[in-house]
Interface confidence: low
Amino acid sequence: EVEKTACPSGKKAREIDESLIFYKKWELEACVDAALLATQMDRVNAIPFTYEQLDVLKHKLDELYPQGYPESVIQHLGYLFLKMSPEDIRKWNVTSLETLKALLEVNKGHEMSPQVATLIDRFVKGRGQLDKDTLDTLTAFYPGYLCSLSPEELSSVPPSSIWAVRPQDLDTCDPRQLDVLYPKARLAFQNMNGSEYFVKIQSFLGGAPTEDLKALSQQNVSMDLATFMKLRTDAVLPLTVAEVQKLLGPHVEGLKAEERHRPVRDWILRQRQDDLDTLGLGLQGGIPNGYLVLDLSMQEALS
């Protein structure tokens, strides 16, 4: 808490300008009118205040607006935003996308902080929905934001946003989210050549259907086991031993270590033991030789 002291003669601030960087903390408190600060917030960011000085300016705004800052002030907080707590931000009513962009810009290049998360939450709740422009903005700043959305919300994510997504940004996405994101990624990367395409699409393959996996198996992609283990079980089951061998390339040897885990375990149960033996990996649990395989799904479709 800064002590209340009288402003020395001739030091009363008439404007928010560079001269203030030479003010001591107590002088800022005594000589800067909070209302002036509020109306000239756009100037604060251009002045190299110290963190301690920013603390004083924040304190003045807090006194002026105990119920929360107006949007006109919020939009021009600049680096002062980094001084805000989630509790401060929860008092705000942010409705302008420009305000959101301005504050996200301040935090650009850093992980999403609790402050930013609270800001986004307030913004989305204020709007009542996650419209395309909002999603476009959020995914541009935070590709990892995608995994915090429901599949329904993800349906309005534009494919163009997918370009900014890094593999680690999808780490917390569940299969239902990848089901929605994969077709968008496929569309976004459709004009890339084979090897470049695979590098980009790899992180999204947890949402890929069987036919796309079959197509990839013809392209010498050498999928690693970690990616294979994240594929949809229902998409892997129809793949033949030859297709899996082509899909994994030199990584096919890793199947042995994963033979008890999904989707490898379930896939093995669907293959002829004869075919599995051709891999030379000692995979066990396939359909014994001489047994007839009935495709019950086809039978149901015909009846």
Epitope: P86, E87, R90, E111, M112, P114, A117, T118, I120, D121, Y142, P143, G144, Y145, C147, S148, S150, Q168, D169, D171, T172
Partner: nanobody, 118 residues
């Protein structure tokens, strides 16, 4: 800062049930999702269940689907994991986790041991 404390672990026979609890405290009002993870000896940490705090959408991996249920009590700041039809392979340390709207769970509890054995 968010603090998470798990309880409810223990020894149970195959086919039995357990209910894990997670008490959350601190700045939890803007938490976007809560989850349960587990880590068996020599294995990596595995997601078991998540619940979205905004709309209560849940997710379970194939390995626990139909056997485990995640739920929460907002008023009590609690998250639960009901585990039924337990198997030996469910033996692990179970961790409660929380995240803001970010790419990873960044707040973790200390974990509670669950052992399924006859």
């Amino acid at each position: 800062e968010v603090q998470l404390v798990e309880s409810g672990g223990g020894l149970v026979q195959p086919g039995g049930s357990l209910r894990l609890s997670c008490a959350a405290s601190g700045s939890i009002s803007s938490i976007y999702a809560m989850g349960w993870f587990r880590q068996a000896p020599g294995k990596g940490r595995e997601l078991v269940a998540t619940i979205n705090t905004v709309d209560d959408i849940t997710y379970y991996p194939d390995s626990v689907e139909g056997r485990f249920t995640i739920s929460r009590d907002n008023a009590k700041r609690m998250v639960y994991l009901q585990m039924n039809s337990l198997r030996a392979e469910d033996t692990a340390v179970y961790y409660c986790a929380a995240r803001y709207m970010t790419q990873s769970f960044s707040y973790w509890g200390q974990g509670t041991q669950v052992t399924v054995s006859s």
